[in-house]
């Protein structure tokens, strides 16, 4: 819950739904100054559980474009470059927050929404052994 | 930019900073009804590039708790259960949006912030050969 000492300089809210409805500044502050996210951009190809990235676009959502990972194989790539079906390629998923325009098509009114996205794939030992 | 036909039923905004400052309903709508995120909860242990999850807490951020993956090994686990340093465990990173209280300690005023989080790890063929 929100139990933080209130700053006397906070904007006032007369909204009857307060604290459910808040003001959000959309000028994004980027905290990733010391890290280069492009550094990992080739992992999808070099991984033993490679994946493809699919563009998911929705103008009613912010951000409107999200990239979804889909594992290329059921198994994992072995040292010979072949798919080994004794191991499984699986998606690593993460719940993220997005803003959904509500009511629809409104430029200045949103609702927080939680969505599950696949970020990449990893190679795991199977728990169900389909391959003898 | 925001160039969507405006719904006549949209809330009105007299804010001079509009459209940079918007109203957001914090009642989260969860779109993940058909997915079980717990299904991937053991991948961190079963992966050939296993990871630990570290809790990152910040009361000035929403969500206040974010889990960060840290790969356990430099190399990847081979079929014998040993670490193979001819392959690299690397973090899969994703840029996510969070809300940062602005001004600080305000319960109803936020700014969008982009942060880079490590979601899990994957095993890749090296580009830098540290191991002969």
């Amino acid at each position: 819950g929100i139990t933080i000492p209130r700053n006397p300089g906070c904007p006032n809210s007369e909204d009857k739904n307060f604290p459910r409805t808040v003001m959000v500044n959309l000028n994004i502050h980027n905290r990733n100054t010391n890290t280069n996210p492009k550094r990992s951009s080739d992992y999808y190809n070099r991984s033993t559980s490679p994946w493809n990235l699919h563009r998911n676009e929705d103008p009613e959502r912010y951000p409107s474009v999200i990239w979804e990972a889909k594992c290329r194989h059921l198994g994992c790539i072995n040292a010979d470059g072949n798919v080994d079906y004794h191991m499984n390629s699986v998606p690593i998923q993460q719940e993220i927050l997005v803003l959904r325009r509500e009511p629809p098509h409104c430029p200045n009114s949103f609702r927080l929404e939680k969505i599950l996205v696949s970020v990449g794939c990893t190679c795991v030992t199977p728990i169900v052994h389909h391959v003898a | 930019g925001i160039t969507i036909p405006r719904n006549p039923g949209c809330p009105n905004s007299e804010d001079k900073n509009f459209p940079r400052t918007v109203m957001v309903n914090l009642n989260i709508h969860n779109r993940n009804t058909n997915t079980n995120p717990k299904r991937s909860s053991d991948y961190y242990n079963r992966s050939t590039s296993p990871w630990n999850l570290h809790r990152n807490e910040d009361p000035e951020r929403y969500p206040s708790v974010i889990w960060e993956a840290k790969c356990r090994h430099l190399g990847c686990i081979n079929a014998d259960g040993n670490v193979d340093y001819h392959m690299n465990s690397v973090p899969i990173q994703q840029e996510i949006l969070v809300l940062r209280r602005e001004p600080p300690h305000c319960p109803n005023s936020f700014r969008l912030e982009k942060i880079l989080v490590s979601v899990g790890c994957t095993c890749v063929t090296p580009i830098v050969h540290h191991v002969a």
Epitope: N34, T35, N36, R39, S40 | W51, N52, H54, K70, C71, R72, H73, L74, G75, V83, Y85, N88, S89, V90, P91, V124, P126, I127, V128, H130, V131
Partner: nanobody, 123 residues
Amino acid sequence: QVQLVESGGGLVQAGGSLNLSCVISRRTPSGYAMGWFRQASGKEREFVAAISWIGGGAVYADSVKGRFTMSRDNAKNTVYLQMNSLKPEDTAVYYCNDMPYGLDTTMDDYDYWGQGTLVTVSS
């Protein structure tokens, strides 16, 4: 900004030993591994050793394998480099740094280094 403080360098005779320390003064390093690197006068900075914070496994450059040992103390946010059987060609400034991509980290991934600690091996 992460702060890295290396210490333990000095002048030593060939065949001698030194133990370097590196303290990371941030709550938790951003990466999952730490590395030691060195730069000899007029040469490019090169990888020496790396260690995983969690698993503790270490990897070494061929030139130091069997002579250098890297270890870490998670509670103190400190890594060490025990250098034995030192050779004149080990003379360099030694640096430590976070390895955000583990063994996949390249020199291009860094925009910050500590001051380093000078190791001089005389023959």
